[in-house]
């Protein structure tokens, strides 16, 4: 009778095992083991027992002990079960960002591992089991579907294999895949709101605001603002589920024309975009040209207004005839025209909007000097000892210098309060002088003596 010990062994792949073959007869003709495995006999005294070291056991095997005794030949098998943990435990790759409400299929693939009867595949979210199935097939595949929720954001999904050899007196061997971290998001179907000037003048700055509500997680949203090829650098303010991106945009003559203003919001693997056109225009203020800004009275003056070729101008409220970018008027300069403003208003239509620009020039008319009765009366009669203020106003541009002298020496104190005395009486020659010439006027002062009764 041949016996083998142990009759059943579970061992790690590539491991070794000692197998003892024994026979019940004292003097067997033959005692040995039949196996394809590498073997060593671990010598023992005596004939009825042999110990073999079987090594590098890669797969399940059934070595057979045999003995040849006087009463015949017999055999006994030992069953070697090899265990090994899977060589690959992997979740099928998925985009890390998933929209809320989508059905997400988790697929775990398991390569290798034995004994398969003791191998289980578990799909997990964090530590919560989603699905548990025995490993079947090569590779074994286990799938489950998850409805993506907002509170799944940042959750780790993984796949674990459990090789449970506790019933065989060994342990539970676990292998876990690399985790898949789910990033959930909500990007509303509505495009972002873009507020910006429809028209923008060259060499000026405008403000662009792009905003969107109903985002999750709002802090992960990327905002791209651009005007044509120019990337804008917005300041982004976040709310609970909204953002507002504000940027300054500066334009130059190179940007003139119709430009595309874009606001793109990228969240997860989706994006929403709003496009708007902005017309960049150049519109210098109109030019008011006077023949000469300073003319003498009586001179013919031409006032011209010139503006952008597509503008329409009015000069001092009178539209150009015909309506267009140029207007002019002719006038003979009078003293009343001194300080007169000539205002040119130009209007340009840009993308349906009317843009207004104004320019004003002032005309200086040189005239005078003038001394007339109204402003410089020729006769004053004042009671003696009364308080009086002699008044004489000379007119002209530039303002003339005025002197009133009696006998060429005694001045009349123009504009000053004086006590009337007999000395003040007489005829004064008032002389108004400027670069434009001089005029004179006689002024007589009469002093009335008080009556004594």
């Amino acid at each position: 009778q041949t016996s083998v010990s142990p009759s059943k062994v579970i061992l790690p792949r590539g491991g070794s095992v000692l197998v003892t073959c024994s026979t019940s007869c004292d003097q067997p003709k033959l005692l040995g083991i039949e196996t394809p495995l590498p073997k060593k006999e671990l010598l023992l005294p005596g004939n009825n027992r042999k110990v073999y070291e079987l090594s590098n056991v890669q797969e399940d095997s059934q070595p057979m002990c045999y003995s040849n005794c006087p009463d015949g030949q017999s055999t006994a098998k030992t069953f070697l079960t090899v265990y090994w943990t899977p060589e690959r435990v992997e979740l099928a790759p998925l985009p890390s960002w998933q929209p809320v409400g989508k059905n997400l299929t988790l697929r775990c693939q398991v390569e290798g591992g034995a004994p398969r009867a003791n191998l289980t595949v578990v799909l997990l979210r964090g530590e919560k089991e989603l699905k548990r199935e025995p490993a079947v097939g090569e590779p074994a595949e286990v799938t489950t579907t998850v409805l993506v929720r907002r509170d799944h954001h940042g959750a780790n999904f993984s796949c674990r294999t459990e090789l449970d050899l506790r019933p065989q007196g060994l342990e539970l061997f676990e292998n876990t895949s690399a985790p898949y971290q789910l990033q959930t998001f909500v990007l509303p179907a509505t495009p972002p709101q873009l507020v910006s000037p429809r028209v923008l003048e060259v060499d000026t700055q405008g403000t662009v605001v792009c905003s969107l509500d109903g985002l999750f997680p709002v802090s992960e949203a990327q905002v791209h603002l651009a005007l044509g090829d120019q990337r804008l650098n917005p300041t982004v303010t976040y709310g609970n589920d909204s953002f507002s991106a504000k940027a300054s945009v500066s334009v130059t003559a190179e940007d003139e024309g119709t430009q595309r203003l874009t606001c793109a919001v990228i969240l997860g693997n989706q994006s929403q975009e709003t496009l708007q056109t902005v017309t960049i225009y150049s519109f210098p203020a109109p030019n008011v040209i006077l023949t000469k800004p300073e003319v003498s009275e009586g001179t013919e003056v031409t006032v011209k207004c010139e503006a952008h070729p597509r503008a329409k101008v009015t000069l001092n409220g009178v539209p150009a005839q015909p309506l267009g970018p140029r207007a002019q008027l002719l006038l003979k300069a009078t003293p009343e025209d001194n300080g007169r403003s000539f205002s040119c208003s130009a209007t340009l239509e840009v993308a349906g909007q009317l843009i207004h620009k104004n320019q004003t020039r002032e005309l200086r008319v040189l005239y005078g000097p003038r001394l007339d009765e109204r402003d410089c009366p020729g006769n004053w009669t004042w009671p003696e000892n009364s308080q009086q203020t002699p008044m004489c106003q000379a007119w002209g541009n530039p303002l003339p210098e005025l002197k009133c002298l009696k006998d060429g020496t005694f001045p009349l104190p123009i504009g000053e309060s004086v006590t009337v005395t007999r000395d003040l009486e007489g005829t004064y020659l008032c002389r108004a002088r400027s670069t434009q010439g001089e005029v004179t006027r006689k002024v007589t002062v009469n002093v009335l003596s008080p009556r004594y009764e």
């Epitope: 060593k40 006999e41 671990l42 010598l43 005294p45 110990v51």
Partner: antibody, heavy 116, light 107 residues
Amino acid sequence: QVQLVQSGAEVKKPGASVKVSCKASGFNIKDTYIHWVRQAPGQGLEWVGRIDPANDNTIYDPKVQGRVTMTADTSTNTAYMELSSLRSEDTAVYYCAASGYWFAYWGQGTLVTVSS
Amino acid sequence: DIQMTQSPSSLSASVGDRVTITCRASQSISNNLHWYQQKPGKAPKLLIYHASQSISGVPSRFSGSGSGTDFTLTISSLQPEDFATYYCQQSNSWPYTFGQGTKVEIK
């Protein structure tokens, strides 16, 4: 009948080398392992190393690693142990033993004396 | 290295006595422990392998037990030819190591 017969006693000077042989009969050395164990005078047993004659794989005690070389000649069914750079503390009876984890059969021992 | 400690180092006993020698490993060695008997001037002789497995030709009065770190060799009834030195040896990990020996003397 399993038997291990070792070479005779050796007297060596410090720094010299010694090579002890162990001839097996009654079994093929390539079917098992050959170990070497030494015993200093009046002391206990000390494992030196092991050879697998089938592939010449060896494992040595770290205490003698670098100085010991174990070889086997399967054609003559003989195992050898060479110890170099001998020191006085290497003085011992050197035994070869056959089997795996335990030592079922022993040679008669070879006394190696290291003395100046 | 795994240290093997035998106790006692020596003992005196009479023929017919029950003798127990213990061997302790510095860490668990499962059942990878073997016992030898050595008489002066002779090579050691295998008595027990794998802690408790008997050897053909070794008297049945020799038995072994234990697992893990603590092991025992028992001679149920000491005979005159049993006076010798006894060694334990572990084969759990390299390098293999022996206990320091227990000398059994006649009382």
